[in-house]
């Protein structure tokens, strides 16, 4: 054989996204001799590996290798042979991986090795796995709607490369759902970011940008499920919780041990006498966001302005992308349409809590019941965590764009993520030739 | 012409130690994943293990038979591979070759002519 | 770990003849099997790489077929040097396995 041929014209990239809820893979492609441009790398593939997210192999660390060999083969398929000992693969842990890790940082270190050791079997050039930091959650999924809405490029266009694309080049502020946090990122208009722990300053292709970022660990969809149910088991009478998170007719056992497994039910635990309690859905979206509410400290606020917690938060600026679950809830539901106002999502969300159960498995027969079941609390959740929380309103609903894919690459902090670690956002505006490295960020 | 070419085999008792060397040419030998394939007496082939990049951190990975107890290591500016051999046993005497592939990977097209490794008492 | 199972153990033929060796992976590992032909006293030689590819400076004679758990290594005509032992390799996953051989002999 002769030596290796001269690299494809192309090149690769895969970034696993370790969430709490599961993993996802992501394989990105880019024209090598472009890769300092803008808007040039996609999204070839997502791989969602089968299982739950890596957090819950803390008791069997020996099935990680086993479950992560579907998606590495499929990427093996997809990325060309005389690639693959090139293409970099890094593996992003999230809140679920934080979570285990304020229980145990021995037991998180553990899952992360096994993980290690199980992706560099592969011939691919790992680059490593990291529980990633719930601002670098926020900046990188920032990052990457900008990048794919063109708001980086220097070049202003006519015309529009996706429906919610204004012209101008203001970024997208970002909102992010995940399993166990969120994270809200945008940049303020002529505010001072008066918490320096939520500030942030890039500097991507010539141009400063000053952006605030938060991420609530905790605050994710099935971490605040917990909390409301630690919350509303407290004042129980019984073993019996009657919810109106949940649709009428809908039951469930729930085991008190499981409840409290969870560091984000801590303030909440007591001394129950009983071991397992069941929900019983009564289905009334107004109860249910009353009850989500008690979940946001909204009396204490060392700032100008807070979102809850005593977290600062500027006044709201510009349009937002929402991705991951906010998208996928409110796809569910059907209401991502730029149409559909607040309250007429209010409107809507008050009559499918209020759909018995039996109705509901009929009408989404092919749906999972685990999910099925928490579509009600979820989207009112979202709801009082947009509204309430980061204080939209119903005149500025409509600058929230939900989004799944942009340019057909998901909305999400895995492309953000690939791109500053393979140093592919240049500080400065590219010339005709690439600059050196030590100009990215 | 690429070449390969072991050293550092001979006699040695159970539980001794010995270190192969492997010097490369006719390569960009820093490019390379490297490894090392044994064969003993009148016997099969065995994978002993490879070394990876520098953009790798040198990642390492052996064969279950030899892990805990042999080191591959690299040093890029000699061209040189290197088989640290500790607590051996009988059944590690076989030939030794160092191996690589210049296309693709996980495959040999180069093989040295091997060094000879006698473990006995 | 991938086994790798070689038949016949030997197999003996006359030159001019075609000769078939097999090679069976205990699981599926796409087209990720090597050949290689060893003589007495020298190193392993790579014949055949991905089931079926072909190397320059290898006679056309030689070839490969298979995917998945089944292999085999063609010599349509055998000339008097191709008497040597044969060794398919799994470079799938991790750890490579070889299999057994098939020596192939003179009748």
């Known amino acids: 054989t002769q030596n290796k041929a001269l690299p494809e014209n192309v090149k690769y990239g895969i970034v696993l996204d370790a969430g709490s809820s599961h993993t996802s893979l992501y394989i990105y492609k880019w024209p090598a001799e472009k890769e300092n441009d803008t808007g040039v790398v996609h999204q070839v593939e997502e791989c969602r590996v089968k299982g739950p997210g890596i957090s819950k192999f803390v008791q069997k660390v020996n099935e990680i290798g086993i479950y992560l060999t579907d998606c590495m083969e499929r990427a093996r398929e997809v990325i060309p042979r005389s690639q693959h000992q090139e293409t970099p693969v890094y593996l992003g842990a999230t809140a679920g991986m934080r979570l285990l890790r304020m229980e145990s940082e021995e037991l998180a270190d553990r899952v992360l090795d096994v993980v290690e050791r199980s992706l560099s079997n592969y011939p691919f050039d790992f680059q490593g796995a990291r529980i990633i930091t719930g601002q670098e959650e926020g900046a990188y999924g920032w990052i990457t709607i900008n990048y794919l809405l063109g708001k980086f490029s220097q070049k202003t266009r006519w015309f529009s490369i996706v429906p919610y694309e204004t012209n101008n080049q203001e970024t997208f502020g970002a909102l992010d759902l995940g399993g166990a946090s969120t994270q809200v990122t945008f940049v303020p208009q002529n505010q001072t970011i008066e918490s320096p722990d939520n500030a942030l300053q890039f500097r991507l292709y010539g141009k400063d940008y000053n952006v605030y970022t938060h991420s609530f660990l905790c605050y994710g969809k099935d971490q605040a499920l917990w909390q409301k149910l630690a919350k509303d088991i407290q004042v129980a009478s019984n073993e019996i919780l009657r919810d109106p998170c949940f649709h009428p007719g809908y039951k469930k056992v729930v085991n008190v041990s499981d409840l409290y497994k969870t560091p984000c039910t801590k303030r909440f635990e007591m001394t129950l006498p009983f071991q397992q309690f069941e929900i019983q859905g009564i289905g009334n979206y107004q109860q249910c966001h009353q009850s989500i509410l008690e979940l946001f400290n909204t009396s204490y606020c060392p700032y100008s302005q807070c979102a809850f917690n005593g977290i600062f938060l500027p006044p709201l600026q510009g349009d937002f992308g929402a991705f991951s679950a906010f998208y996928f809830v409110m796809k569910f539901l059907n209401l991502t349409s730029e149409k559909v106002s607040q309250e007429k999502v209010t409107e809507m969300m008050k009559k499918f809590c209020a759909q018995p159960w039996e109705e509901i498995k009929t009408s989404y027969a092919g749906v999972k019941e685990k999910y099925l079941s928490e579509y009600c609390f979820s989207g009112t959740y979202i709801l009082s965590l947009l509204l309430q929380g980061y204080h939209f309103t119903a005149d500025s609903w409509e600058h929230i764009h939900f989004i799944g894919k942009i340019q057909g690459s998901d909305a999400g902090w895995t492309l953000g993520y690939m791109l500053n670690l393979t140093n592919m956002i240049p500080a400065e505006q590219p010339l005709s030739t690439p600059l050196s490295h030590s100009t990215y960020v | 012409e690429v070449q390969l070419v072991e050293s550092g085999g001979g006699l040695v008792k159970p539980g001794g130690s010995l270190r192969l060397s492997c010097a490369a040419s006719?390569?960009?030998?820093?490019?390379?994943?490297m490894n090392w394939v044994r064969q003993s007496p009148g016997k099969g082939l065995e994978w002993v293990g490879e070394i990876r990049l520098k953009s790798n951190k040198y990642g390492t990975h052996y064969a279950e038979s030899v892990k805990g107890r042999f080191t591959i290591s690299r040093d890029d500016s000699k061209n040189t591979l290197y088989l640290q051999m500790n607590s051996l046993k009988t059944e590690d005497t076989a030939v030794y070759y160092c191996t690589t592939q210049l296309d693709l990977y996980w495959f040999f097209d180069v093989w040295g002519q091997g060094t000879t490794v006698t473990v006995s008492s | 770990e991938i086994v790798l199972t070689q038949s016949p153990a030997t197999l003996s033929l006359s030159p001019g003849e075609r000769a078939t060796l097999s090679c069976r992976a205990s699981?599926?590992?796409?087209?990720?099997l090597h050949w290689y032909q060893q003589k007495p006293g020298q190193s392993p030689r790579l014949l055949i790489y991905y089931a079926s590819q072909s190397i320059s400076g290898i006679p056309a004679r030689f070839s490969g077929s298979g995917s998945g758990t089944d292999f085999t290594l063609t010599i349509s005509s055998l000339e008097p040097e191709d008497f040597a032992v044969y060794f398919c390799q799994n470079g799938h996953s991790l750890p490579l396995t070889f299999g057994g051989g098939t020596k192939l002999e003179i009748k």
């Open positions: 006719g390569f960009t030998f820093s490019k390379y994943w």
């Open positions: 699981q599926s590992i796409s087209d990720y």
